[in-house]
């Protein structure tokens, strides 16, 4: 049976018999009998429970160095077996043993739950020598005990390579319940059941759990820890906590918010970062996610033009990053742009619409009726064309780009010329004689360079040839342009 010493109990004696320093005669463990007697007990009796055989760890009797006498077995005296106290109290307990003086260099060590206690522990060993035996008291004290001090403490003594072990002293530190698992915040679907878990431990046990929702206790009857609360469903946000109580008091867990998933709020601050003739780069600030991660977003684009049919172009994109390049737009056009994002519950409303414009585009058609002829006297090539019929979206014509390629005996050289928008003719110097010159012309606006016209070739003869017939682009649908000599 365990001897219990509650904190309110009177201090227990260090020894069951007289104080150390005198021979112990009553409740003796026979260690104090003169070792010259040769008496060897077969059993050791517990001093706390006389008449019951003691089966603790004892040192086997052995012959002395003189070889003449037997020594009785050595064993620690019984002390209190179980100490129960509250957290933050102080505790002191001890082991005692009487050792015949024939033994030298006896040391006592303290062990807790199988591990030796070293270093910064308050352990004191006192020696009380007598004629034939020395009473040794090893005291262990803990100030302001904590739960971590709970455990089984024993003394060990080494004599002549033999180890003597005391009975365990169980220290039980009692306090308020301590949470090992607390409820966690969750985001849940409306009217859908979910579970919360709470677990707390003593000592003392049992620990009982009450659940609290929005400051109201949910269960009239406590549940033994651990407890799982099944909530059948919520229609609005709620705060849950659990209260754990034992015979020492009550501890409350952290309060956790259970949120109801909803559609996201609309994105805000849609911004234009870059516009080209056919694309617009936008960004946005996501709205509140409705307690559910964003899945994707939708960019909605409407052309702002009285003549347009008002249709909406929809571009789906990932929710992150919060940017999207809208492509396939018309040049020099006005658009209204909005963004909506979705989570598992549904789509948000559309963000406030913003206006954006594309820039001028490059011309989409080449100059017409390109004609090339040689003005041999001046060593020049004359080029003439007609202004292309560009759309408004291409913007204002700023000029033309002329590409002329000279090919002769395996050598090829391309040159580019720029001329103003008011011109419809140009002259270029002959670069090489006895060569072919291929001419293409493209219209240029602020939006860029349009497509080049079909190539027109003219042969530049060696010096002495005379032929001023022009070359020109054919009418639409004709074969490739030919050189007219």
């Amino acid at each position: 049976a365990i001897t219990e010493a509650r904190e309110e109990a009177k201090p227990y004696p260090l020894f069951p018999g007289p104080l150390p320093g005198s021979l112990q005669t009553d409740h003796t463990s026979l260690l104090s009998l003169p070792h010259t007697s040769g008496y060897q007990p077969a059993l050791m009796f517990s001093p706390t429970q006389p008449g019951r055989p003691y089966t603790g760890n004892v040192a086997i009797p052995r012959v002395t160095s003189a070889g003449s006498k037997l020594l009785p077995p050595l064993a620690f005296k019984h002390t209190v077996g179980h100490i129960i106290l509250s957290e933050h109290k102080d505790v002191k307990f001890n082991c005692s043993i009487s050792v015949p003086n024939i033994y030298q260099d006896t040391t006592i060590s303290w062990w807790k739950d199988g591990k030796e206690l070293l270093g910064a522990h308050h352990a004191i060993t006192q020696f009380y020598p007598d004629d034939e035996v020395t009473a040794i008291i090893a005291s262990f004290s803990i100030t302001s005990v904590q739960r971590s001090d709970n455990g089984s403490y024993i003394c060990k003594m080494k004599i002549n390579n033999e180890e003597i072990v005391s009975d365990p002293i169980y220290i039980e530190v009692q306090g308020l319940p301590h949470f090992t698992k607390q409820p966690e915040s969750m985001n849940v679907t409306r009217n859908t059941a979910f579970n919360l878990t709470c677990q707390a431990v003593g000592p003392p046990e049992p620990v009982n759990i009450f659940w609290v929702q929005n400051s109201s206790r949910v269960n009239e009857q406590p549940e033994k820890s651990p407890s799982v609360l099944t909530v059948p469903g919520l229609t609005e946000m709620a705060v849950f906590s659990c209260e754990a109580h034992n015979d020492k008091g009550l501890t409350v867990s952290k309060g956790v918010q259970i949120n109801i998933k909803a559609i996201p709020s609309p994105p805000t601050e849609v911004s234009i970062h870059n516009s080209t003739a056919h694309s617009i780069l936008i960004s946005w600030v996501p709205g509140f996610d409705g307690y559910s991660p964003f899945r994707n977003c939708s960019v909605q684009v409407k052309e702002v033009d009285p003549l347009s049919n008002g249709s909406v172009m929809i571009f789906n994109t990932s929710a992150s990053p919060h940017m999207y390049q809208i492509k396939q737009l018309q040049a020099l056009a006005n658009y209204s742009i909005g963004v909506s994002c979705m989570n598992e519950i549904g789509w948000s409303a559309v963000s406030p619409w913003i206006l954006a414009s594309t820039t001028e585009g490059a011309p989409s058609v080449a100059p017409l009726n390109v004609t090339v002829f040689l003005n041999e006297s001046r060593d020049n090539v004359d080029i003439r064309w007609m202004k292309p019929l560009t759309k408004r979206q291409a913007g204002e014509l700023v000029g033309y780009r002329i590409s002329h390629v000279w090919q002769s005996a395996g050598i090829s050289k391309e040159l580019l010329e720029e001329v103003g928008q008011n011109n419809s003719r140009a002259q270029i110097s002959v670069q090489v004689h006895n060569a072919t010159c291929t001419v293409r012309i493209a219209a240029v606006t602020k939006g860029g360079v349009g497509p080049f016209s079909d190539p027109v070739k003219i042969f530049i003869p060696a010096h002495g040839w005379v032929d001023h017939a022009p070359s020109s682009t054919p009418a639409p649908g004709n074969a490739d342009p030919v050189l007219i000599i």
Epitope: P204, E205, P206, N208, F210, V212, E220, P222, N246, D247
Partner: antibody
Amino acid sequence: QVQLKESGPGLVAPSQSLSITCTVSGISLSSFAISWVRQPPGKGLEWLGVIWTGGGTDYNSALKSRLTISKDTSKNQVFLKMNSLQTDDTARYYCASHWYLDVWGTGTTVTVSS
Amino acid sequence: QAVVTQESALTTSPGETVTLTCRSSTGAVSTSNYANWVQEKPDHLFTGLIGGANSRAPGIPARFSGSLIGDKAALTITGAQTEDEAIYFCALWFSNHWVFGGGTKLTVL
């Protein structure tokens, strides 16, 4: 639903002892500590003592020498015994759940008179 | 032993908010005093309203709330109703015993 019901003798002679039983239903005494409280006529409430789930007890220090609280968990009953009653022990005696004083019995009136 | 003090009587009107307080002679009331509020109605009917960590007992209307205000425990009734007319006792736990206040008689006119 948790319910507590007190039963007592009603009339006790001075210097005699009082025994009251609190019968608990809807909950096990192994998970509910029970306190005893009394209210003298026209006065406030006075806490008498508690019996813990593990069977330990704590008492009002002014009454400790005269009080004993015990329980029979198998019958779900808690017992209050008070010795050496005097006329100022006349009161209505209640048992109540402990950490939350939210479940009370209806009480039993005890009159100390010769 | 600690003495727990409450207002002896308070009067309020239906729909008004009223706060009852509970003071300890030993100093500030803390969470470890587990302030409990108990309502007494005629015919010895006691009902616990608030306990533990200022949580309402099951079935107690949300207009009753417990808190610690300054160095006192408080019971606030937000939007008092005529049926709230009663005597309200506060109880504080001191390590190993409860101490009850003298009670506050609340009248709802």
